[in-house]
């Protein structure tokens, strides 16, 4: 699987999950998030050669088409597969609130 | 929606579904498919600027991060959203068989 366990340990040029730290205030302008100050959102990147973690029949077909037609511009793209939530602390005035934000952290990627 | 109705009628540079005709024999080397000879598989391409048909909170966050950090290499990618099956005719010996191949035709795209 193209997950953090594999991708963070290997120098993988092809589609893989990459580490990306986002600072809420500096990178997003989100002053309302109190904790954490930032988090590893991660992202997916890298070429999708034929059959690399293909998501659907279409992506497999497109990968094969691309292999046999190297000049073609149509190819699968490396995108998130598994995402995890992130728990944040924010304040409503002086009252602390805890919220779980869904689909915030990329754990693995696929070729789609 | 970034679907064929919209994308095929507009000169859209950003993420959209594009027409792509695949000839089974010539483009894939699939001699076993008898009918159709080929089909419009289509594909997704084009930049994913901030908030364009964002798929998840992560892709929205990544788009926002990218907007505020233009030098960043992490950005969402244009990939299939809705896929449709394709019915094909092939032969097992002299016996015709009809099969529905799932997820063969891209009908719309998203930024993921």
């Amino acid at each position: 699987a193209l997950d953090t366990n594999y991708c963070f340990r290997n120098l993988e040029e092809n589609c893989c999950v990459r580490p990306l730290y986002i600072d809420f205030r500096q990178d997003l302008g989100w002053k309302w998030v109190h904790e954490p100050k930032g988090y590893y959102a991660n992202f997916c990147s890298g070429p999708c050669p034929y059959l690399r973690s293909a998501d659907t029949t279409h992506s497999t077909v497109l990968g094969l088409y691309n292999t046999l037609n190297p000049e073609a511009s149509a190819s699968p793209c490396c995108v998130p597969q598994d995402l995890e939530p992130l728990t944040i602390l924010y304040y409503v005035g002086r009252t602390p609130k805890v919220e779980q934000l869904s689909n915030m952290v990329v754990k693995s990627c696929k070729c789609s | 929606a970034l679907d064929t109705n919209y994308c095929f009628r507009n000169l859209e540079e950003n993420c959209c579904v594009r027409p792509l005709y695949i000839d089974f024999r010539q483009d894939l080397g699939w001699k076993w498919v008898h009918e159709p000879k080929g089909y419009y598989a289509n594909f997704c391409s084009g930049p994913c600027p901030y908030l364009r048909s964002a798929d998840t909170t992560h892709s929205t966050v990544l788009g926002l991060y990218n907007t505020l950090n233009p030098e960043a290499s992490a950005s969402p990618c244009c990939v299939p959203q809705d896929l449709e099956p394709l019915t094909i005719l092939y032969y097992v010996g002299r016996t015709p068989k009809v099969e529905q191949l799932s997820n063969m035709v891209v009908k719309s795209c998203k930024c993921s």
Epitope: G29, W32, R94 | T60
Partner: antibody, heavy 120, light 108 residues
């Protein structure tokens, strides 16, 4: 420049619902919280609630809970306030306003206001 | 909820006079959860002061704010004709946000 443009005036019957829109431009929409404030004719200001775009976290004044829904459409940079089960006393100008950044905060930019009239 | 009591309800002063409006909270707001707004007829409120004493961008220096805890004040050092408006204080320490009832400022 920062602008918040609201939808036009509405006349509604008691018991019905109204949905007011507020389209933001001139700043990074998803970086700020949007609050809604209403003002009855000749009266003072009353906070309705606030919403955080992208994550759609909404906070409401207790008196409106169950009747008001605040949502944000990040694809169009638009925030919506829907108020249901309208009463004559809901007749007011409804303003959307951008906060300085926190969920409860001062409000630095305001929409032009939308007059909602509730009358039988 | 926190009740904000503004005084006076109305004020009529001469041009160039000093204006002071006070705002009292029913419970402590700490030092920074208070804002002041100006509203002219038919217009939306305009933020003047936030964090009790910080002037919003573009607001003339004749406007100032001070205070902490439960007692806050707003001052116009020298009244100008364009200052005729209703002024509101607002607390954002606790939900719901609440406003004072307003002070109507006129020129004699």
């Amino acid at each position: 420049q920062v602008q918040l443009v609201q939808s036009g005036a509405e006349v509604k019957k008691p018991g019905s619902s109204v949905k007011v829109s507020c389209k933001a431009s001139g700043y990074t929409f998803s970086s700020n919280v949007i609050s809604w404030v209403r003002q009855a004719p000749g009266k003072g200001l009353q906070w309705v609630g606030g919403v955080i775009p992208i994550v759609d976290i909404a906070n409401y004044a207790q008196r409106f809970k169950g009747r008001v829904t605040l949502t944000a459409d990040t694809s169009t940079n638009t925030v919506y306030m829907e108020l249901s089960n309208l009463r004559t006393e809901d007749t007011a100008v409804y303003y959307c306003a951008r906060t300085l950044g926190l969920v409860l905060d001062a409000m630095d930019y305001w929409g032009q206001g939308t007059l909602v009239t509730v009358s039988s | 909820e926190i009740v904000m009591t503004q005084s006076p309800a109305s004020l009529s002063l001469s041009q160039e006079e000093k204006v002071t409006i006070t705002c009292r909270a029913s419970q402590s707001l700490g030092s920074s959860y208070l804002a002041w707004y100006q509203q002219k007829p038919g217009q939306a409120p305009k933020l003047l002061i936030y964090g009790a004493s910080s002037r919003a961008p573009g607001v003339p220096s004749r406007f100032s704010g001070s205070g902490s805890g439960t007692d806050f004040s707003f001052t116009i050092s020298s009244l100008e004709p364009e200052d005729v408006a209703v002024y509101y204080c607002q607390q954002y320490a606790d939900s719901p946000i609440t406003f004072g009832q307003g002070t109507k400022l006129e020129i004699k």
